[in-house]
Interface confidence: low
């Protein structure tokens, strides 16, 4: 008996070849002996089976002695033994229909679990192997699970079902819904405009949801919602925004926020959450703001930074084109009685300058100028 594997929803062609290369009387029936399809001369006749509206045959091939049975929109319950009787010949084909589906949706939030479930006909004992877009192989029986989906899991998963030394391949497109970056940090001098961008790592035709940016300023005891917004078909509309700071938001994707000016009281960490329509859970991106201020008060030149800095960051004060006068892994440095000239305050990481602020120190009879 010939075995043919089919995929749920697909179309399958079961072949039946007569020894005589001409159109002769034939019919197909199932294991229940119910007629499915046959011919009346050069015309097709359909039997009373429940497949009635989903079966066909290639009439153009009858003259060559080929009597195919085409079953469209395959269902698991179509799995059966199909018998072709042509002239005095009889051919049997065992059709096994499999389905592979993602647990709920193929659009999953980062960190969620993906469960692939194999639907198979009774009496079959298939094995399944899936390969993720990043080349990771997983094996299983009726179900395969991948926990903690990552961004790299987005793409086409290729799954092979093996049964009776035959195989059928499924391709499932999985979209992991996440921001491109889990976290970002913006370094700004006091007074500068701040741009926060939250690019998504996926594209969908219609994107609807709502979001909010919560901000924990370093100086504040509790976090505060800075802005809430809606997203409808990739168009952004602001619902509510604080008066201080008054953030502005771009109307198109990627999500883009502008803080008119960086001030020490705004330095801190934010968490942008995006809840997508019909999805449980939220997308998150952390954003950090580090603000630098260089000031001269009487005989003291001070440089300070506010916000989430790593302990390995170095804060330095130096006179232009000279060695650093002071360099510390701290959030404030100062020089007493600084000599006149252009001073630079530098925040650096392993020699790479992240933020720089210049302040001109005038001879002692003048007041300082901040460029």
């Amino acid at each position: 008996k010939k075995v043919v594997l089919g995929k749920k929803g697909d179309t399958v062609e079961l072949t039946c070849t007569a020894s005589q290369k001409k159109s002769i009387q034939f019919h197909w029936k199932n294991s229940n002996q119910t007629k499915i399809l046959g011919n009346q001369g050069s015309f097709l006749t359909k039997g009373p089976s429940k497949l009635n509206d989903r079966v066909d045959s290639r009439r153009s091939l009858w003259d060559q002695g080929n009597f195919t049975l085409i079953i469209k929109n395959l269902k698991i319950e179509d799995s059966d033994t199909y018998i072709c009787e042509v002239g005095d010949q009889k051919e049997e084909v065992q059709l096994l229909v499999f389905g592979l589906t993602a647990n709920s949706d193929t659009h999953l939030l980062q960190g969620q679990s993906l469960t692939l479930t194999l639907e198979s006909p009774p009496g079959s004992s298939p094995s399944v192997q899936c390969r993720s877009p990043r080349g990771k192989n997983i094996q299983g029986g009726k179900t395969l699970s991948v926990s903690q989906l990552e961004l790299q899991d987005s793409g086409t998963w290729t799954c092979t079902v093996l049964q009776n030394q035959k195989k059928v391949e499924f391709k499932i497109d999985i979209v992991v819904l996440a921001f491109q970056k889990a976290s970002s940090i913006v370094y700004k001098k006091e007074g500068e405009q701040v741009e926060f961008s939250f690019p998504l790592a996926f594209t969908v035709e219609k994107l609807t949801g709502s979001g909010e940016l919560w901000w924990q300023a370093e100086r504040a005891s509790s976090s505060k919602s800075w802005i809430t917004f809606d997203l409808k078909n990739k168009e952004v509309s602001v619902k509510r925004v604080t008066q201080d700071p008054k953030l502005q938001m771009g109307k198109k994707l990627p999500l883009h926020l502008t803080l008119p000016q960086a001030l020490p009281q705004y330095a801190g960490s934010g968490n942008l959450t995006l809840a997508l329509e019909a999805k449980t859970g939220k997308l998150h991106q952390e954003v950090n703001l580090v603000v630098m201020r260089a000031t001269q008060l009487q005989k003291n030149l001070t440089c300070e930074v506010w916000g989430p800095t790593s302990p390995k960051l170095m804060l330095s004060l130096k006179l232009e084109n000279k060695e650093a006068k002071v360099s510390k892994r701290e959030k404030a440095v100062w020089v007493l009685n600084p000599e006149a000239g252009m001073w630079q305050c530098l925040l650096s990481d392993s020699g790479q300058v992240l933020l720089e602020s210049n302040i001109k120190v005038l001879p002692t009879w003048s007041t300082p100028v901040q460029p």
Partner: antibody, heavy 118, light 111 residues
Framework: QVQLVQSGAEVKKPGASVKVSCKAS????????ISWVRQAPGQGLEWMGE????????YYNEKFKGRVTMTRDTSTSTVYMELSSLRSEDTAVYYC???????????WGQGTLVTVSS | DIVMTQSPDSLAVSLGERATINCKAS??????????MNWYQQKPGQPPKLLIY???NLESGVPDRFSGSGSGTDFTLTISSLQAEDVAVYYC?????????FGGGTKVEIK
Amino acid sequence: QVQLVQSGAEVKKPGASVKVSCKASGYTFTAYVISWVRQAPGQGLEWMGEIYPGSGSSYYNEKFKGRVTMTRDTSTSTVYMELSSLRSEDTAVYYCARSGDGSRFVYWGQGTLVTVSS
Amino acid sequence: DIVMTQSPDSLAVSLGERATINCKASQSVDYDGDSYMNWYQQKPGQPPKLLIYVASNLESGVPDRFSGSGSGTDFTLTISSLQAEDVAVYYCQQSLQDPPTFGGGTKVEIK
């Protein structure tokens, strides 16, 4: 203030097409969705579809798919609704309506009567 | 599509009396704690005017004698004290699911 001004009444023969315009003013044209809603004489209201003036993307009620086309001209802040293969049952007042915070239909045009008659 | 059924078709109420209009959706129009139901008033020869949005929120400029209530599938528009200028046709409309659908309308007259 927000204003939606529609083109004048039209009389069409069955099988013809009609194109109704809706000129928006008093707000940022690209910021709000504009819908088209029709009302047959003495009947209720029926949503035909909507257009996003920013992108030009439009979404239609299944009932009108294949017969309705919604377009926009950002240079004149005007939205157009074209209905083809007109039949007598398309005789109605056609309204454009702009969305707001609470609803899809906050601001309405004055309506355009389209009469389909042989 | 969600089917909206309004009752009654018409209503005659004395000036100063309460008028109540009901609307039933074929399926729930609730989402995330809100009911996506709006109410409109339409006078002859005029476009509809939004009165109530999201079941119970009064649109700006609408007199507070109008109120909306309900959730899930059953909603009510109430005019607490009918005025002469309230004579109109009132429509409910769901905005949860495309296509947005309207009720058949309720004509309010003075008794």
